[in-house]
Interface confidence: low
């Protein structure tokens, strides 16, 4: 008996061939001997089966002795043994229809689980193997689960169903809803304008939801909501914003926030959350702000940074074009009785300068100038 695998929703063509290369009488029946279709001369006739409106044949092939049964919009319950009667012969074909669907939705938030469920006919014992867009293979039976989806899991998942040494392939497009970056850090001198950007790693036609930026300033004991906003069809509207600082927000995607000026009291970490309509859970992006200040008070030249710096970052004070006078893995460095000239405060990571602030030290009879 020939075995043919089909996919739910697809079309299958079951073949039946006579030895005579001409149009002769044929019938297709199911295992209950109910006639599905056949011919009466050059006319196609249909029986009382459930397939009635979904069954067809190709009259153009009858003259060559081919009498296919075409079943459109396959259903799992179409799985059956189909019998072609032609020239006093019976050809049996076993059709097994499978379906593979994603748990709820193919648009999932980063960190959520993807469950693929196989629908299969009774009596079958298929195995499934899926390959993710980043090349990860997973195997299973009736259900396959992938926990903690990552951004790289976005794309086409290819799943192969094996039964009776035959296979059928399913392709499922999965969109992982996430920000392009899980975390970002902005380095600014005191007083500079700060731009925070939160680009999304996906595109959808309509994007609706609401979001909020919570901020934990390094100097504050608790976090504070800096801004809340709504997103409607990719248009951003601010719902509320703190008085200090009063952030400004772009009206279009990507989400874009402007802090009028970087101040030590704002240095810290923020968490932007975005709740999308009809989705449980939220998208998150962490953003960090490091602020630098260089000051001269009487005979003391000081450079300080505030915010989440890593222990390997180096803070240095140096006179322009000279060796660093002081260089420490600390958040504040200073030089007593600095000589006149342009001093540079540098925050660097493995030799790469992340932030630089210049301060001009005048001879002792005048006051310092901040360029």
């Amino acid at each position: 008996k020939k075995v043919v695998l089909g996919k739910k929703g697809d079309t299958v063509e079951l073949t039946c061939t006579a030895s005579q290369k001409k149009s002769i009488q044929f019938h297709w029946k199911n295992s209950n001997q109910i006639k599905i279709l056949g011919n009466q001369g050059s006319f196609l006739t249909k029986g009382p089966s459930k397939l009635n409106d979904r069954a067809d044949s190709r009259r153009s092939l009858w003259d060559q002795g081919n009498f296919p049964l075409i079943i459109k919009n396959l259903k799992i319950e179409d799985s059956d043994t189909y019998i072609c009667e032609v020239e006093d012969q019976k050809e049996e074909v076993q059709l097994l229809v499978f379906g593979l669907t994603a748990n709820s939705d193919t648009h999932l938030l980063q960190g959520q689980s993807l469950t693929l469920t196989l629908e299969s006919p009774p009596g079958s014992s298929p195995s499934v193997q899926c390959r993710s867009p980043r090349g990860k293979n997973i195997q299973g039976g009736k259900t396959l689960s992938v926990s903690q989806l990552e951004l790289q899991d976005s794309g086409t998942w290819t799943c192969t169903v094996l039964q009776n040494q035959k296979k059928v392939e399913f392709k499922i497009d999965i969109v992982v809803l996430a920000f392009q970056k899980a975390s970002s850090i902005v380095y600014k001198k005191e007083g500079e304008q700060v731009e925070f950007s939160f680009p999304l790693a996906f595109t959808v036609e309509k994007l609706t939801g609401s979001g909020e930026l919570w901020w934990q300033a390094e100097r504050a004991s608790s976090s504070k909501s800096w801004i809340t906003f709504d997103l409607k069809n990719k248009e951003v509207s601010v719902k509320r914003v703190t008085q200090d600082p009063k952030l400004q927000m772009g009206k279009k995607l990507p989400l874009h926030l402007t802090l009028p000026q970087a101040l030590p009291q704002y240095a810290g970490s923020g968490n932007l959350t975005l709740a999308l309509e009809a989705k449980t859970g939220k998208l998150h992006q962490e953003v960090n702000l490091v602020v630098m200040r260089a000051t001269q008070l009487q005979k003391n030249l000081t450079c300080e940074v505030w915010g989440p710096t890593s222990p390997k970052l180096m803070l240095s004070l140096k006179l322009e074009n000279k060796e660093a006078k002081v260089s420490k893995r600390e958040k504040a460095v200073w030089v007593l009785n600095p000589e006149a000239g342009m001093w540079q405060c540098l925050l660097s990571d493995s030799g790469q300068v992340l932030l630089e602030s210049n301060i001009k030290v005048l001879p002792t009879w005048s006051t310092p100038v901040q360029p």
Epitope: K224, S225, S237, K239, D244
Partner: antibody, heavy 129, light 113 residues
């Protein structure tokens, strides 16, 4: 007492610009947003935008974007609203209005959009050729 | 933008009688986090700037007579003058301050019958 005093009436030609001032007194100028609202003759109220006198940050209604500029001078506690490329339909009374002060902040201390508790007396701007 | 629709456009009420003005917003102005309705009512007399009467939909501004009251939640709101006085003749506006652009209703003119 708390008040907003606006500059006097203006007559302008189409295509010109007008700059209306709003001087605040009786409260901490930098603490509360100043909004601008206009009212065409016999018509309703239309919000144009607002400025945070503390930071200078602005938020303009889409309709006026590109034509309106709101600025402030903290030394004189004055807010300015400049409207350019004037047309006859800009003929209106222009009001500055302060958003309600901190008594109406919510218990968590967050600042929300608020109602307007103090209004200037209004400045009539007539655009005519 | 949130559209504010007021009804009726004008209203004539006898002195001492009740006046009721309705205001409907095109979307809810109730913010669930603090359970507040971002709706205000203003009174404007001829030649004067508007005056704040009610904020948070039902809180009377200090100095406003208690014959003025606000009610409603979500999208439907009402301003009630329980006993109309001669000095209440004015145009009344509702305003949402839930989200920018802040928008006003078209106004309701209250007169004495």
């Amino acid at each position: 007492q708390v008040q907003l005093v606006q500059s006097g009436a203006e007559v302008k030609k189409p295509g010109a610009s007008v700059k209306v001032s709003c001087k605040a007194s009786g409260y901490t100028f930098t603490s509360y947003d100043i909004n601008w609202v206009r009212q065409a003759p016999g018509q309703g109220l239309e919000w144009m935008g607002r400025i945070n006198p503390g930071t200078g940050g602005t938020d303009y209604a889409h309709k006026f974007q590109g034509r309106v500029t709101m600025t402030r001078d903290t030394s004189t506690s004055t807010v300015y609203m400049e409207l350019s490329s004037l047309r006859s339909e800009d003929t209106a009374v222009y009001y500055c209005a302060r958003e309600t002060p901190s008594d109406y902040y919510d218990s968590s201390g967050y600042y929300y959009n608020d109602a307007f508790d103090i209004w200037g007396q209004g400045t009539t701007v007539t655009v005519s050729s | 933008d949130i559209v504010m629709t007021q009804s009726p456009d004008s209203l004539a009420v006898s002195l001492g009688e009740r006046a009721t003005i309705n205001c409907k917003s095109s979307q809810s102005v109730l913010y669930s986090s603090n359970n507040k309705n971002y709706l205000a009512w203003y009174q404007q007399k001829p030649g004067q700037p508007p005056k704040l009467l009610i904020y948070w939909a039902s809180t009377r501004e200090s100095g406003v007579p208690d014959r003025f009251s606000g009610s409603g939640s979500g999208t439907d709101f009402t301003l009630t003058i329980s006993s109309l006085q001669a000095e209440d003749v004015a145009v009344y506006y509702c305003q949402q301050y839930y989200s920018t652009p802040l928008t006003f209703g078209g106004g309701t003119k209250v007169e004495i019958k």
